[in-house]
């Protein structure tokens, strides 16, 4: 049997289909690029992004990037292909339905990033340790 997500050629174009011929629809993500943010010292924040976009490619997931430096705080919301690095980092949590922020090392700023794959999941960004996915029970909940 043909596994799901097999690439099939239709009119010489590679489109993502399952073995019954249905076409995979891209993710719906908040997509405001970089905006100034008031999100600081909170367990979670809403993006305050009013634009929900259909991602360009079916394999893309939702991404949020929170950055704080001496001058300002910004929140970036986009779609991105998890096979490709974003801001030089791999999107390791792309299969999660929730956008759980993880700190990344960037000189001169505090930098958090999350990725996820459910509708508009980068609208609610979560910093709280309660959601730390090193907890195996939570991993079961997230990936069920």
């Amino acid at each position: 049997t043909i596994p799901p997500h097999v690439q099939k050629s239709v009119n010489n174009d590679m489109i993502v289909t399952d073995n019954n011929g249905a076409v995979k629809f891209p993710q719906l993500c908040k997509f405001c690029d970089v905006r100034f943010s008031t999100c600081d010292n909170q367990k979670s924040c809403m993006s305050n992004c009013s634009i929900t976009s259909i991602c360009e490619k079916p394999q893309e997931v939702c991404v949020a990037v929170w950055r704080k430096n001496d001058e300002n705080i910004t929140l970036e919301t986009v779609c991105h292909d998890p096979k490709l690095p974003y801001h030089d980092f791999i999107l390791e949590d792309a299969a999660s339905p929730k956008c759980i922020m993880k700190e990344k090392k960037k000189p001169g700023e505090t930098f958090f990033m999350c990725s996820c794959s459910s509708d508009e999941c980068n609208d609610n960004i979560i910093f709280s340790e309660e959601y730390n996915t090193s907890n195996p029970d939570l991993l079961l909940v997230i990936f069920q």
Epitope: V23, K24, F25
Partner: nanobody, 124 residues
Amino acid sequence: EVQLLESGGGLVQPGGSLRLSCAASGFTFFNYEMAWARRAPGKGLEWVSLISADGTRTYYANSVRGRFTISRDNSKNTLYLQMNSLRAEDTAVYYCAKRRDASMGHTTRRFDYSGQGTLVTVSS
């Protein structure tokens, strides 16, 4: 048998408008999300717009936001795409598509599209 019949395409000048229609049959139209996709010459399939089953929620690709409007008339089993401020890069065959299942939430959306689509050519 599910049938989706697109119409309304044609030749239009840049900056012009067109309204595409999709007549649906063979399924309970008001239970399903519907979408429009397009395939430009030599390019891949691009999803341009999505509408919820009840028509209250609409979504767009960045490439068409602010210019295209998706709508539906559940009493007529018809899906529409109003296209304004058309550009040369909007030239494509446009396809109406139906979600494979009626469920919502954190499930991967899969869509079926059939028929020949309707050709939109934007040229002066």
